[in-house]
């Protein structure tokens, strides 16, 4: 799986890497200005595992399966 | 304060086993993944098991695989370590410590004071 | 799986010394890497993550960089409390592998 993945959050994430086996979804999420890109585990696609992980009480998130498919556009839909 | 306390170490014979036990405080320990980690004598780190903070999922390195076995209660807030078919390559201090630091996975930030484990006849 | 190989395995340096580790992966791990500092008798410390992140509370002399294959530790001016072993470990998957160590002495 191939997910955009920067190691802090930033605007405009467009580093793409293939993520390990251990790792079956992309994570993208907006906590107010951050904006996180992250290979993820599906299992921890849960509002609670998500904001426990950033550290984040607020912030909208979009859990994903196809390479490449954690694009700020997501966030939007 | 986050606290980790192993305990379940000691003397066991090649061929036996051993069951290791962490205790976690001063966190929500049902929301973190855990790993165990091991150092021989004198020698490095070796991770030994990892484990998700539901349970779902588990990972080993081969060295351990088929033998080792981890698991969680989350209502006792406590991580286990089942060790089985116990080998003199496995003395070590072994630490428990807390996985997924800052939404990254396999990073360790919190680790317990270690329980020592020898195995000889 | 993953190798890391540390360099050198140990290093004498003075207090005040501008000290570099280096860390090399096998294959390309980006920028998955983390360091500890262990003391002996203690439990590992966490230092760096994501290759040049510093984690909460550790003091800004320490440095990391790299990406791929390559990375460094570097401790700008050494304190008394830096003398001890520092380990590399990646966390770009399992399983996680850890590099040999090095172990900083004073000269």
């Known amino acids: 799986l191939q997910c955009y993945n920067c190691p802090n959050p930033t605007a405009d994430c467009k580093t793409a890497v293939n993520c390990s086996s251990d790792f079956d979804a992309c994570l993208i999420t907006k906590a107010g200005l951050q904006v996180y890109n992250k290979c993820w585990k599906f299992e921890h696609c849960n509002f609670n595992d998500v904001t426990t992980r950033l550290r984040e009480n607020e912030l909208t998130y979009y859990c994903c399966k196809k390479d490449l498919c954690n694009f700020n556009e997501q966030l939007e839909n | 304060e986050v606290q980790l306390l192993e305990s379940g170490g000691g003397l066991v014979q090649p061929g036996g086993s051993l069951r290791l036990s962490c205790a976690a405080s001063?966190?929500?320990?049902?929301?973190?993944?855990m790993s165990w980690v091991r150092q021989a004598p004198g020698k490095g780190l070796e991770w030994v098991s990892y484990i998700s903070s539901g349970g779902g999922s588990t990972h080993y390195p081969d060295t351990v695989k088929g033998r080792f076995t981890i698991s969680r209660d989350n209502s006792k807030n406590t991580l286990y370590l089942q060790m089985n078919s116990l080998r003199a390559e496995d003395t070590a201090v072994y630490y428990c410590?807390?996985?997924?630091?800052?939404?990254?996975?396999?990073?360790?930030?919190?680790w317990g004071q270690g329980t020592s484990v020898t195995v000889s006849s | 799986d993953i190798q890391m190989t540390q360099s050198p395995s140990s290093l004498s340096a003075s207090v005040g010394d501008r000290v570099t580790i280096t860390c090399r992966a096998s294959?390309?791990?980006?920028?998955?890497l983390a360091w500890y500092q262990q003391k002996p008798g203690k439990a590992p410390k966490l230092l760096i993550y994501?290759?040049?992140t510093l984690a909460e509370g550790v003091p800004s002399r320490f440095s990391g960089s790299g990406s791929g294959t390559d990375f460094t530790l570097t401790i700008s001016s050494l304190q008394p409390e830096d003398f001890a072993t520092y380990y590399c470990q990646h966390h770009y998957g399992s399983p996680l592998t850890f590099g040999q160590g090095t172990k900083l002495e004073i000269k």
């Open positions: 294959e390309n791990i980006y920028s998955y």
């Open positions: 001063g966190f929500a320990f049902s929301s973190y993944d």
């Open positions: 410590a807390r996985d997924g630091y800052y939404a990254e996975y396999y990073v360790m930030d919190y």
């Open positions: 994501n290759a040049k």
